[in-house]
């Protein structure tokens, strides 16, 4: 960052998107700012316009190509700059040499579906989205289940330490509404972080069978 009050954070989704957030205390209002990407070994440059997400925070997505195209590799370094317009000139507000595969955040898992549901258990599957083939099987997942009367923050985390795109939830209560979420993280990258949580999947366990009269 150019000064101590500025923070510039970016993540690569492993395919064709670098998402950036720039925060600055007392930043200029009504000023046009851009993120500019300058790869060290590619023939393209890319910009995106920073849009406000809060009073002192701006965000944008550098869309490098079609969603599933592999635009960067582990050896790439991309110089990322925040530039803001000052009159007819552009001023560099922040800069970083970005190593994409050290700063990964994948897209949230998609296509969640109930494969099989019973009274006390439910089998759920999902898919990963726009994840690089470089990872092979080197991914991990976290999942959580929302029970009635609780919040997501109270839900215990279930960890899957391998690329396993399904889970069997057990010890559930019969005839009860639940919600389920999952997120993914590559094992690679010093500053890699968890993906956003998936959209919640709602499901209901089957009612318990009625006992026979004695």
């Amino acid at each position: 960052a150019v000064n101590g009050t500025s923070q510039f954070t970016c993540f690569y989704n492993s395919r064709a998107n670098i998402s950036c957030v720039w925060s600055q205390d007392g930043a200029l209002q009504d000023t046009s700012c851009q993120v500019h990407a300058w790869p060290d070994r590619r023939r393209w440059n890319q910009t995106c316009e920073l849009l406000p997400v809060s009073q002192a925070s701006w965000a944008c997505n550098l869309i490098l190509g079609a969603p599933d195209s592999q635009k960067l590799t582990t050896v790439d370094i991309v110089t990322l700059r925040v530039l803001c317009r000052e009159g007819v000139r552009w001023r560099v507000m922040a800069i970083q040499d970005f190593k994409p595969f050290e700063n990964l955040r994948l897209m949230a898992p998609i296509s969640l579906q109930v494969v099989h549901v019973e009274t006390h258990r439910c089998n759920i599957s999902w898919e990963i989205s726009q994840a690089s083939h470089y990872f092979e099987r080197h991914l991990e997942f976290e999942a959580r289940t929302l029970s009635p009367g609780h919040t997501w923050e109270e839900a215990p985390l279930l960890t899957l330490k391998q690329k396993q795109e399904w889970i069997c939830l057990e010890t559930l209560t019969p005839d009860t509404q639940y919600e389920f979420q999952v997120r993914v993280k590559p094992l690679q990258g010093e500053f890699t972080t968890w993906s956003p949580w998936s959209q919640p999947l709602a499901f209901r366990t089957k009612p318990a069978a009625l006992g026979k009269d004695t």
Partner: nanobody, 123 residues
Framework: EVQLVESGGGLVQAGGSLRLSCAAS????????MAWFRQAPGKEREFVAS????????DYVDSVKGRFTVSRDNAKNTVYLQMNNLKPEDTAVYYC????????????????WGQGTQVTVSS
């Protein structure tokens, strides 16, 4: 790479209006800063207006400020140039241009171009 097709040109009297459209295909439209340029007979191609990926920020050559408005519809992969109060000196072939780098959009050699649409303003 993106492909661009302009439409909406024609013959109009001075003081009239035209709306040019540029339809993009072949790549992710929101990757691109879009611009309009024009080239009058015997003159260099010149920058007219540009619009950033989000559509929030626009830029114009001084001679069209207050008369022309550039906009984009990312859902329709289209950029527009609304031209009001047209003058005979606006007569030119108008070209749509695209560049992934906002800071290169005014450089003629770095852009992807459409084939152009003729605008003629009679007095």
């Amino acid at each position: 790479e993106v492909q661009l097709v302009e439409s909406g040109g024609g013959l109009v009297q001075a003081g009239g209006s035209l709306r040019l459209s540029c339809a993009a295909s072949g790549d992710v439209f929101v990757r691109y800063t879009m611009a309009w340029f024009r080239q009058a007979p015997g003159k260099e191609r010149e920058f007219v207006a540009s619009v950033t990926d989000s559509g929030r920020t626009t830029d114009y050559v001084d001679s069209v400020k207050g008369r022309f408005t550039v906009s984009r519809d990312n859902a329709k992969n289209t950029v527009y140039l609304q031209m009001n109060n047209l003058k005979p000196e606006d007569t030119a072939v108008y070209y749509c241009a695209a560049n992934t780098d906002y800071f290169q959009i005014k450089s003629l050699d770095r852009n992807t171009w459409g084939q152009g649409t003729q605008v003629t303003v009679s007095s």
